[in-house]
């Protein structure tokens, strides 16, 4: 088992909004849960965009999930990752 490296980034979207992206990379096996939580509960499926789980060329895998949020509300969002029985949560950087 190779645990993922998780990285959260932000980019400007439309006025007053930002897109936050949570990337998991270099993990094996390929089964992974990667999702955004808002206010501690699941963000609806429709509010998130997922990338495919793809090989990264080193025998491991990578994927991502993104959502658009209002600037100033970053604290309310965390990226949740679960892989091979381990889990972690990742805040949006300031």
């Amino acid at each position: 088992t190779v645990p993922p490296m998780v990285n959260v980034t932000r980019s400007e979207a439309s006025e007053g909004n930002i897109t936050v992206t949570c990337r998991a990379s270099s993990f094996y096996p390929r089964n992974i849960i990667l999702t955004w939580r808002q206010d501690g509960v699941s963000l609806s499926h429709d509010a998130q965009q997922w990338g495919d789980v793809l090989p990264d060329g080193n025998g491991t895998y990578q994927t991502w999930v993104a959502t658009r949020i209002c600037r100033g509300e970053e604290q309310r969002f965390t990226c949740y990752m679960e892989h091979s029985g381990n889990h972690s949560t990742h805040p949006v950087p300031s």
């Epitope: 849960i33 939580r37 206010d39 501690g40 509960v41 699941s42 509300e73 604290q75 309310r76 969002f77 965390t78 949740y80 679960e82 029985g85 889990h87 949560t89 805040p91």
Partner: antibody, heavy 119, light 107 residues
Framework: DVQLQESGPGLVKPSQSLSLTCTVT?????????WNWIRQFPRNKLEWMGY???????NYNPSLKSRISITRDTSKNQFFLQLISVTTEDTATYYC????????????WGQGTLVTVSA | DIQMTQSPASLSASVGETVTITCRAS??????LAWYQQKQGKSPQLLVY???MLADGVPSRFSASGSGTQYSLKINSLQPEDFGSYYC?????????FGAGTKVEIK
């Protein structure tokens, strides 16, 4: 460590309003987290009532939405529960608690305060 | 709303026994589940979050498992301090709801 302490009247008459205070020590309620009220009925059923978060945004249980209000006094690091038009069915132990945004579970609770609704 | 159904409502067990409590959600809650222990006259205390993760300070005789709609809490070698009531709680969506509880009593 975050500590929470509920206070308020232990007896309220039917049709009146129930008002409770949660005093938080060890953490500023404007820094982070969602600050919640939960109640436990005499037969031990637990009910999440709602929260006010660090920025003042509220979220209520739809079963209570027409009767509940959660507010705060940031200068005293307190948040409040008001429940209007109470009946005997609102007799319960009322707890304040909080959760972090990594998941809506409750790591610490106040000691609880029993409120009896009776004429 | 997601309803949480706990079973059994109560059980009697002896010190040293293994007990299992189950919690069924009315919809898939995707491991968004917590377990609490409550002693008589005290506040609930967090035992488990994210369905399987033990909270800080919880003894390793407690374990939890499950997925989808079915979850369980297992206590190996029951100790005198484990007697009390146990509640599950989902946090998949609002409103947050709790199970009705399981009371673990001394046989």
């Amino acid at each position: 460590d975050v500590q929470l302490q509920e206070s308020g009247p232990g007896l309220v008459k039917p049709s009146q309003s129930l008002s409770l205070t949660c005093t938080v020590t060890g953490y500023s309620i404007t820094s982070d987290y969602a600050w919640n009220w939960i109640r436990q009925f005499p037969r031990n059923k637990l009910e999440w009532m709602g929260y006010i978060n660090y920025s003042g945004t509220t979220n209520y249980n739809p079963s209570l939405k027409s009767r509940i209000s959660i507010t705060r006094d940031t200068s005293k690091n307190q948040f409040f529960l008001q429940l209007i038009s109470v009946t005997t069915e609102d007799t319960a132990t009322y707890y304040c608690s909080y959760y972090r945004y990594d998941g809506a579970w409750f790591p610490y609770w106040g000691q609880g305060t029993l409120v009896t609704v009776s004429a | 709303d997601i309803q949480m159904t706990q079973s059994p409502a109560s059980l009697s067990a002896s010190v040293g026994e293994t007990v299992t409590i189950t919690c069924r959600a009315s919809g898939n809650i995707h491991n968004y589940l917590a377990w609490y222990q409550q002693k008589q006259g005290k506040s609930p205390q967090l035992l488990v979050y994210n369905a399987i993760m033990l909270a800080d300070g919880v003894p390793s005789r407690f374990s939890a498992s499950g997925s989808g709609t079915q979850y369980s809490l297992k206590i190996n070698s029951l100790q005198p301090e484990d007697f009390g009531s146990y509640y599950c709680q989902h946090f998949w969506s609002f409103p947050l709801t709790f199970g009705a509880g399981t009371k673990v009593e001394i046989k």
